[in-house]
Amino acid sequence: ILGGREAEAHARPYMASVQLNGAHLCGGVLVAEQWVLSAAHCLEDAADGKVQVLLGAHSLSQPEPSKRLYDVLRAVPHPDSQPDTIDHDLLLLQLSEKATLGPAVRPLPWQRVDRDVAPGTLCDVAGWGIVNHAGRRPDSLQHVLLPVLDRATCNRRTHHDGAITERLMCAESNRRDSCKGDSGGPLVCGGVLEGVVTSGSRVCGNRKKPGIYTRVASYAAWIDSVLA
């Protein structure tokens, strides 16, 4: 997260760290007791590694009573996701068992009504991604509030030049932005999950290259079918 600040500890009990061989790889969001939603591209290079999900964490390194690492029983990338596009960049991870819920571990309601969030709406994005252009990784969860950007502006040639389909949304990126390592994490508007950080190699913090988020409402049928 660029231009953000440290989050209040455990105030986002839905927040997950998707880990590869014990190290943070991507963000994720607990959407059901046994399911974490993340980004499909996160697992592209994880073929031989051990994927796990950390829940109830604020610090990645310090012991915390609520922290628990879960093995992954099943990884379900969206069937239409492809390595070279940002489209359909969603992944559902089934935990080896139901998460132990409590004040620091709780699923987040996700948007089912397929309607765009109004431009200018302030949404919260959180993650353990890099916090500066030098690539410094934080130990504790960071967050930032970002205004939603209208899709027409996001589709301008100087922004994302037509790449933003109706299944994607954008948020402003003027020095405050999601960045590498935040992919798969939640964009939360009005206490509801609206978007998932896409995992392309986008430049961060440049206002002409807005953050791109997969709209979960557009994938309600797929999410429901996997969770069923």
Epitope: D150, A152, R157, T158, D161, G162, A163, V203
Partner: antibody, heavy 116, light 112 residues
Framework: EVQLVESGGGLVQPGGSLRLSCAAS????????MNWVRQAPGKGLEWIGD????????DYNADFKRRFTFSLDTSKSTAYLQMNSLRAEDTAVYYC?????????WGQGTLVTVSS | DIQLTQSPSSLSASVGDRVTITCRSS???????????LEWYQQKPGKAPNLLIY???NRFSGVPSRFSGSGSGTDFTLTISSLQPEDFATYYC?????????FGQGTKVEIK
């Protein structure tokens, strides 16, 4: 299939007004800026300006700012170009073109002839 | 405003020829985001322009590989490696980095 269809061109007297329409189909109208470009007979392409179909924000080439106005009817997925105080030198084919990707999608153009 | 000057204004060539059109801008067209929004369009008589090249050197989908773009800063080139009968048309460069966006005056490619 993305389609842009202009209409409203024709013969108009100097000092007169005309409103051109650009009807869009095959995509969600509010997802892309609409631009207007004109081409005088035997001449090059000239950008008039653009409009954001979500916010209604506009940007005009300074040469056209006083006499030309963009508007929208999102319920009809249509953009409009209102042209006032027309002069002989405004005689041209007028195009609408969607921005994103680049100017990949253009209308067929509509001819405006300003003559007495 | 940024002026784009194309050369030549017109040229005569034969099928199979290699054709090069240049476009010079009055100032740099590198955008503040680091990209260069230099595009090339092909226009045939009575028709709307068609996008060929975007961001200096990227071919738009469906554009034959004989079309290529290059350049940086203020000097840009469109090359047609082996001219085909359907390539006889007018070609325009365009800059989208700075408002107002502008087109070159065009280069007409005619049959020799």
């Amino acid at each position: 299939e993305v389609q842009l269809v202009e209409s409203g061109g024709g013969l108009v007297q100097p000092g007169g007004s005309l409103r051109l329409s650009c009807a869009a189909s095959g995509y969600i109208f509010t997802s892309y800026y609409m631009n207007w470009v004109r081409q005088a007979p035997g001449k090059g392409l000239e950008w008039i300006g653009d409009i954001n179909p979500v916010t209604g924000d506009t940007d005009y080439n300074a040469d056209f700012k006083r006499r030309f106005t963009f508007s929208l009817d999102t319920s009809k997925s249509t953009a409009y170009l209102q042209m006032n105080s027309l002069r002989a030198e405004d005689t041209a084919v007028y195009y609408c073109t969607r921005e994103g990707p680049s100017f990949a999608y253009w209308g067929q153009g509509t001819l405006v002839t300003v003559s007495s | 405003d940024i002026q784009l000057t194309q050369s030549p204004s017109s040229l005569s060539a034969s099928v199979g020829d290699r054709v090069t059109i240049t476009c010079r801008s009055s100032q740099t067209i590198v955008h503040s985001n680091g990209d260069t929004y230099l595009e090339w369009y092909q226009q045939k008589p009575g028709k709307a322009p068609n996008l060929l090249i975007y961001k200096v050197s990227n071919r738009f989908s469906g554009v034959p590989s004989r079309f290529s773009g290059s350049g940086s800063g203020t000097d840009f080139t469109l090359t047609i490696s082996s001219l085909q009968p359907e390539d006889f048309a007018t070609y325009y460069c365009f800059q989208g980095s700075h408002v107002p966006v502008t087109f070159g005056q065009g280069t007409k490619v005619e049959i020799k």
